[in-house]
C-alpha cells in the first residue's frame, strides 16, 4: 500500500503504542539508483532495524518511560558506502499506556494548621508521581481523603484540592477546629491516577498527621480606664499577637473622630495617648488590624472596646438661674409646689450623679422660717406649716443647696403666693358650628379660633388657660395652641385630615387652669364646647407601605427568579397598577397586579450594587394618579470574574545581553468583592515550555515575581502566559500575557535604530 | 546519534612520522565509505584519502606514497598512517562517513609539522 506503509525517503512520524510486541513492519523506504542500502542511526536503543532493502521495523516492545521519542535518521548509500540520499529524520512517538502507578513522595506526611485560618488556604501538600504521560489521564492524578480521624458530627475539616494535593480547611474546619478539643487529626489521602474516573485506575495512599495550633490572633477583652488620668501617657491599657512574628500593627477608627486618643506599636502592645474624658465619650469601639511586609492584611481585623470609667468630676447644676413656682393663698399643707430638678453630667445612676436637695434659706421668714420643705432625693418642694396670704407675704426666696458625694452648688427658687384658684374658665360660646375642609388641606393650617375666660388673678396659673381636645380627634390630627395674653386658643392641623377614615369628626374642647381648683369647686358645661369638622374627599394618589424597599439576592440568580415586591395602596381603594422606571439596564420586571419583582437577565454585582430603581404605583380608573417609591437590589458577590493584570504592562524590558538573572513584579486584581482581606491569587505559568526560561513566585495575595531562570535569551520580545487562579469558589483562572522585550540599551534605555519599530518598551529592569 | 572521534593529532618535526585514528559510534560501520579530509589555515577543505565500504582506497596527490589509510571493521576505527611529514601537511584533519556532500563528520584533530 504505497504512501502508508511503503514509499520514498523522505521526513516521516510514526506513533507507536508502548508495551505492545511488534506485529508489523514500520514502512518500506523505496531506493532511488544508485542508492543499494539503507542505514539506520539515531536512538535506536537496538529496537529499531532497517533492512538493507529498507524495511524499517522494531524488534520488540517500546517503553515510553524509557524514551518516550526515538530520533532516527536514514540515509541511503551506493555501492561504495557513499550516501547518495539523507540522512532523513524519522521520529517514533511512543504514546502511553497506563503501565505505572502513582506513587506518594513521602509514605507520611506532617503538617500544621492554625485554628480559624481561612477557608481553602493550603497548610500542606501532598504530592505523588507517575511515570506516565501526564497529558494523558494515564498520569493525570486525583486526590482524595479517604478518611479523617477524628471525624466530629460527620462533618469535614479538612479539603483536599483534587488536581494540586493542595490540604486546606473546610468552611467548618475553620469555624470549629479548636487545639483545646482536639488538638491532632490523621487524614488518610488517596490519589488515583486515570483522573479518578476508572474503575481499572491506580491508586496509592498516604497518611497525614496534623496538628492544631492556637490562633492567637484573638479580640482581647473589653478594657476599661478611668477618665482624667495624670499617669503619664501614654499608657499600655492591652494587647493584640498576630501568629507569627514581622507583621505591621494599625488602628483604624471606624467612627472618624475628630480626636482618636489611641495608638499602637510594633509589638502589637496598644495605648490610649491622652486623658480621657466620659462626658466627652464614654466608649470607644476601633479594630487592630494586622498586615504583610507588602501592606496587605493577614486576616480580619480585631475588635477593640474600651469603656471609660466614670470619676466624680462634675458639680450638680442648676435648671435655670432662678425656678419659678406659684402657690395659692388657701392651699393645704403637704401640697405639691413644684420639683426642683438639677443635673449632673457624670454617671448616672451612680454615687457620682445622685443628688440630695436641702434648703439652706428662706427669704422673708414671715410669718416664721421653716414654711417649705423639700424632699432630700426627688426635690420635690412642699408647703411645710401653714397657708400662705398673698396680702402679707406675696413672694418667698428659697437658697437649696444640691450636693452630689462631692461637690455643692446653690440653686435658686422663686415662689409667687398667688389668688385662690375658684373661678373656672367659660367658653364663651358652647358650640362653634360647623367647619368644612378639603382632605388636602394643609398641615400648620389654622381652622378655628376659640376662646374662654377666666376671672381669676390675672397672669397667675389660677387665670391661664389651657385648651384640650378631649373627644373626637384619636388620631391627634388637631392641636390648640394658647395665646398666654389673650387666653385665645388656635385650633390646628399637626397631621393630614383623611376623607377616607373620619369624614365627620365631633370634636369637644376642654378649657382647665394649670393651678388646681380650690377645694369644693369643679369644672362645668361652661368649661366645654363642641364643633363639628366635616372633611371633603381629594382624589389622592396611592400610597406605597415604604418610601424605600430594599431586598438582596446572589448576583448569579436564575433568570425570572422572584427578587423583591412593592406593596401600595389607593386611599379611595381603586386597583393599582406597578411598573418600573430608570431600570437603566434592563434586568427586572414588576407584576402590574400584585407588585412582585423579577429578574429578565442575568445581575452582575460588579456593574454596581445596590441597583437603584423606582417603582410606581398608579389608580387604575379615576383620575390615574400614581405615586413614586424606591427599590433598592443589593446584589451579594458571587465568584465570576477571573483575575487579570492590575494595569497595563506593555514596555517591560531587559538589556541584553542579561549579565545575570533579572525579575520584575506585576499585580493582579479581579472585580469581585473582598473584604477586609482582599485577594488570594496564586500565580503559575501559563504552559510547562516556558519553565525551562521562565520561573513565577508569588510575593502575597495579589503580587509575583516573574524571574528569568539564565541569562541566554535572544535580543526580541518574549511572551510570558501567566496563570493567576483566584482560589474563590467556584475558582476561578485568568490567562494573562506580560510581554518581555530583550533589548540593546542605551543609557538604560531600549535602543531602536530610526524607521525600526513603534511602541519603543519603556520600563527596564 | 552518530559519533566520529579523532585522535592522535600532534607537533612533529619535518621527515617524522604520525597515526591518526577515527572510532565511529551509533552507525553500522562496515556499510560506510569511510575518508580523511584536511583544512589548513585559509584554504578549502581538501579530501587526503579515503577507502569504500569493499576496501578500495584513494589517495590525494600530494599525499601518495606517504599517506596510507586502512580501516578495522571489527573496532568501528579507521586509521591515517603519515609518514615523512612536511610543513605543508600541517592541517585539522577530519573524519568523514558516508562522503562529503552528505555524510557525517568529526570535530577534527590538529597537526603541526615544524621545527
Known amino acids: 500500500q504505497e504512501g502508508k506503509f511503503s514509499g520514498p525517503l523522505k521526513p516521516m512520524t510514526f506513533s507507536i503504542y508502548e508495551g505492545q510486541e511488534p506485529s508489523q513492519i514500520i514502512f518500506q523506504f523505496k531506493a532511488n539508483p544508485p542508492a543499494v542500502t539503507f542505514e539506520l542511526t539515531g536512538e535506536t536503543d537496538n529496537i529499531f532495524v532497517i533492512e538493507r532493502e529498507g524495511l524499517l521495523y522494531y524488534n520488540r516492545a517500546l517503553d515510553r518511560e524509557t524514551r518516550s521519542t526515538h530520533n532516527l535518521q536514514v540515509a541511503a548509500l551506493d555501492a561504495n558506502g557513499i550516501i547518495v540520499e539523507g540522512p532523513v529524520p524519522i521520529t517514533i512517538k511512543v504514546k502511553d499506556i497506563n503501565d505505572n502507578r502513582p506513587t506518594f513522595l513521602q509514605s507520611k506526611y506532617e503538617g500544621s494548621v492554625r485554628q480559624n485560618s481561612r477557608p481553602g488556604k493550603p497548610f500542606l501538600y501532598v504530592n505523588a508521581t507517575d511515570l506516565d504521560d501526564p497529558a494523558t489521564p494515564n498520569g493525570q492524578l486525583y486526590y482524595q481523603i479517604v478518611i479523617q480521624l477524628p471525624m466530629i458530627n460527620n462533618v469535614m475539616y479538612f479539603q483536599i484540592n483534587n488536581k494540586t494535593g493542595a490540604i486546606s480547611l473546610t468552611r467548618e474546619g475553620s469555624q470549629e477546629l479548636n487545639p483545646a478539643k482536639n488538638p491532632s487529626y490523621n487524614l488518610v489521602i488517596s490519589v488515583k491516577d486515570m483522573g479518578g474516573q476508572s474503575e481499572n485506575s491506580f491508586s496509592d495512599t498516604t497518611s497525614v498527621d496534623i496538628i492544631v495550633t492556637e490562633n492567637i490572633w484573638k479580640a482581647p477583652k473589653p478594657v476599661e480606664m478611668v477618665e482624667n488620668s495624670t499617669d503619664p501617657h501614654p499608657i499600655k491599657i492591652t494587647q493584640v499577637r498576630w501568629n507569627d512574628p514581622g507583621a505591621q500593627y494599625s488602628l483604624v477608627d471606624k467612627e472618624k473622630l475628630p480626636r482618636f486618643p489611641f495608638s499602637i506599636d510594633q509589638e502589637g502592645d496598644i495605648y490610649v495617648t491622652q486623658p480621657l474624658d466620659r462626658e466627652e465619650k464614654d466608649a470607644y469601639v476601633f479594630y487592630a488590624v494586622a498586615k504583610d511586609e507588602y501592606g496587605k492584611p493577614l486576616s480580619y481585623p480585631l475588635e477593640i472596646h474600651v469603656k471609660v470609667k466614670d470619676i466624680n468630676d462634675n458639680p450638680p447644676t442648676c435648671p435655670s438661674p432662678v425656678t419659678v413656682f406659684e402657690v395659692q393663698e388657701n392651699e393645704r399643707l403637704g401640697n405639691s409646689i413644684g420639683t426642683l430638678t438639677a443635673h449632673d453630667r457624670d454617671e448616672e445612676n451612680t454615687a457620682n450623679s445622685f443628688l440630695n436637695y436641702r434648703i439652706v434659706e428662706q427669704t422673708p421668714k414671715l410669718p416664721m422660717d421653716g414654711l417649705f420643705l423639700i424632699q432630700t432625693y426627688a426635690g420635690m418642694l412642699q408647703l411645710a406649716k401653714q397657708s400662705l396670704k398673698k396680702q402679707d407675704t406675696p413672694q418667698y426666696n428659697l437658697t437649696i443647696e444640691v450636693s452630689d458625694k462631692d461637690f455643692k452648688t446653690l440653686c435658686f427658687v422663686q415662689i409667687n403666693v398667688i389668688d385662690i384658684n375658684d373661678q373656672i374658665p367659660i367658653f364663651e360660646k358652647s358650640d362653634y358650628g360647623n367647619l368644612t375642609l378639603a382632605e388636602d388641606t394643609n398641615i400648620g393650617s389654622t381652622i378655628l379660633t376659640i376662646q374662654a375666660t377666666d376671672a381669676d388673678e390675672p397672669f397667675t396659673g389660677s387665670s391661664k388657660i389651657l385648651y384640650h381636645i378631649i373627644k373626637g380627634d384619636s388620631e391627634g390630627r388637631l392641636g390648640v395652641d394658647t395665646d398666654p395674653h389673650t387666653n385665645t386658643g388656635y385650633v390646628i392641623i399637626k397631621k393630614p385630615l383623611d376623607f377616607e377614615t373620619a369624614a365627620v369628626s365631633n370634636i369637644v374642647f376642654k378649657a382647665e387652669n394649670p393651678e388646681p381648683l380650690v377645694f369644693g369647686v369643679k369644672y362645668n358645661a361652661s368649661s366645654f364646647a363642641k364643633f363639628t369638622l366635616i372633611v371633603t374627599d381629594v382624589n389622592e394618589a396611592p400610597q406605597f407601605s415604604q418610601h424605600v424597599f430594599q431586598a438582596k439576592v446572589s448576583e448569579d440568580v436564575a433568570i425570572g427568579t422572584k427578587v423583591g415586591n412593592v406593596t401600595a395602596k389607593d386611599p379611595e381603594g381603586l386597583d393599582i397598577s406597578y411598573s418600573l422606571r430608570g431600570d437603566t439596564r434592563g434586568w427586572l420586571k414588576i407584576d402590574h397586579v400584585t407588585g412582585e419583582i423579577f429578574s429578565v437577565a442575568p445581575l452582575d454585582r460588579e456593574a454596581g450594587s445596590p441597583y437603584r430603581v423606582q417603582v410606581v404605583a398608579t389608580e387604575v380608573g379615576g383620575s390615574s394618579l400614581s405615586s413614586v417609591s424606591e427599590f433598592h437590589l443589593i446584589l451579594m458577590d458571587v465568584n465570576d470574574n477571573p483575575p487579570r493584570l492590575a494595569k497595563d504592562y506593555t514596555g517591560l524590558f531587559f538589556c541584553h545581553p542579561l549579565s545575570a538573572p533579572g525579575s520584575l513584579i506585576f499585580e493582579a486584581t479581579d472585580d469581585d468583592q473582598h473584604l477586609f482581606r482582599g485577594p488570594h491569587f496564586t500565580f503559575s505559568l501559563g504552559s510547562g515550555s516556558l519553565q525551562n526560561d521562565w520561573e513565577v513566585s508569588k510575593i502575597n495575595g495579589t503580587h509575583a515575581r516573574l524571574s528569568t531562570r539564565h541569562t541566554e535569551f535572544e535580543e526580541r520580545e518574549y511572551v510570558v502566559l501567566i496563570r493567576i487562579n483566584d482560589g474563590g469558589r467556584p475558582p476561578l483562572e485568568g490567562i494573562v500575557s506580560l510581554p518581555v522585550t530583550f533589548c540593546s540599551c542605551v543609557e538604560g534605555s531600549c535602543f531602536r535604530p530610526a524607521g525600526h519599530q513603534t511602541g519603543i518598551p519603556t520600563v527596564g529592569m | 546519534e552518530v559519533q566520529l572521534v579523532e585522535s592522535g593529532g600532534g607537533l612533529v618535526q619535518p621527515g617524522g612520522s604520525l597515526r591518526l585514528s577515527c572510532a565511529a559510534s551509533?552507525?553500522?560501520?562496515?556499510?560506510?565509505?569511510m575518508g580523511w579530509y584536511r583544512q589548513a589555515p585559509g584554504k578549502q577543505r581538501e579530501l587526503v584519502a579515503n577507502i569504500f565500504k569493499d576496501g578500495t582506497t584513494n589517495y590525494a596527490d600530494s599525499v601518495k606514497g606517504r599517506f596510507t589509510i586502512s580501516r578495522d571493521n571489527a573496532k568501528n576505527t579507521l586509521y591515517l598512517q603519515m609518514n615523512s611529514l612536511r610543513p605543508e601537511d600541517t592541517a585539522v584533519y577530519y573524519c568523514n562517513a558516508g562522503g562529503a556532500a552528505l555524510g557525517y563528520w568529526g570535530q577534527g584533530t590538529q597537526v603541526t609539522v615544524s621545527s
Open positions: 551509533g552507525m553500522r560501520f562496515s556499510q560506510y565509505a
